[in-house]
């Protein structure tokens, strides 16, 4: 039975040209996290594997940095980075947990972080 929940940074906004940290946290389960995938819509951004460490997709290497922790840092943001991001936690023995973050990249300096929320 899957008892865990994923807490994410929720809906967030950031300025064009700036950076943002995408963070998810798995709680309420004793399952072992074997791997975390980060996806943007239909693109694999990065993988953090418990044994092998980080793999950043080559096409994103210039703008994506691993961490902090199991999170992901996006740099040199453009308006095209606006959209949904997913953290996919592969665990044993529970299976897969998925969290969603919506990022809006703004032209102006009025960007501010949204509230944290939970996805069961």
């Amino acid at each position: 039975m899957m008892t865990g929940t994923i807490e994410t940074t929720g809906n967030i906004s950031a300025e064009k040209g700036g950076s943002i940290i995408l963070q998810c946290h798995l709680s309420s389960t004793t399952a072992q996290v074997t791997q975390v995938n980060w996806e943007q819509q239909d693109q694999l951004l990065a993988i953090c594997n418990a044994d092998l460490g980080w793999h950043i997709s080559p096409s994103f290497k210039d703008r994506v940095a691993p961490g902090p922790g199991l999170g992901l840092t996006l740099q040199s943001l453009t308006v095209n980075d606006t959209g949904e991001y997913f953290c996919i936690y592969h665990t044993y023995p529970d299976g897969t947990y998925t969290g969603r973050i919506f990022l809006e990249v703004l032209e102006s300096s009025v960007a501010e972080h949204g509230a944290r929320f939970q996805i069961p």
Epitope: T34, Q35, D42, Q43, L44, I47, N49, L52, H90, P93
Partner: antibody, heavy 118, light 107 residues
Amino acid sequence: EVQLLESGGGLVQPGGSLRLSCAASGFTFSSYSMNWVRQAPGKGLEWVAYIKSNSGTKGYADSVKGRFTISRDNSKNTLYLQMNSLRAEDTAVYYCARGPYDYWLDYWGQGTLVTVSS
Amino acid sequence: DIQMTQSPSSLSASVGDRVTITCRASQSISSYLNWYQQKPGKAPKLLIYAASSLQSGVPSRFSGSGSGTDFTLTISSLQPEDFATYYCQQSYSTPLTFGGGTKVEIK
């Protein structure tokens, strides 16, 4: 240099058993998921089974489920495929392949031929 | 199970030609699509992983694109050593499944 060397293939009668081995070297075997993929003569590639690094998670193709068992011995850097109740349609070259991050197969062995025939 | 459909099943081309092979998944597989090259009597060799990432040591004339259900492998300028069979493979879910293959022959 990464190397994968399969062995254990041969001729076996229908209903018989065989155990394939894959000896790994040149990398930290215990950190990687491993797979078996087969190719019938003149045909395409068919995934058979996989096992994650800690042996906790395994998966099988429907065509071999209940007949084949994948296992590994990380202390011996060796992957195994126990094949029971073999059928003529299991005749193929069997490859072991390394699966980093579970999503692609970056190194393959040279293959071992299994022939099931009476 | 996710079905992978490759086209064409075979093609004839000349050295220097631009060659395109397509692969379609029966459902969305995000970018979990890999391409392999196989020569007769040899094991497959990984060319492209995660739809567009070039495997280390593979010549830059090979490229991959696509996401969701439709994917493409392109060889920008075919070389003599590129005559082989090419397979796509999805790793979105088990069972892992391969396309039927595309044999690239000399015209």
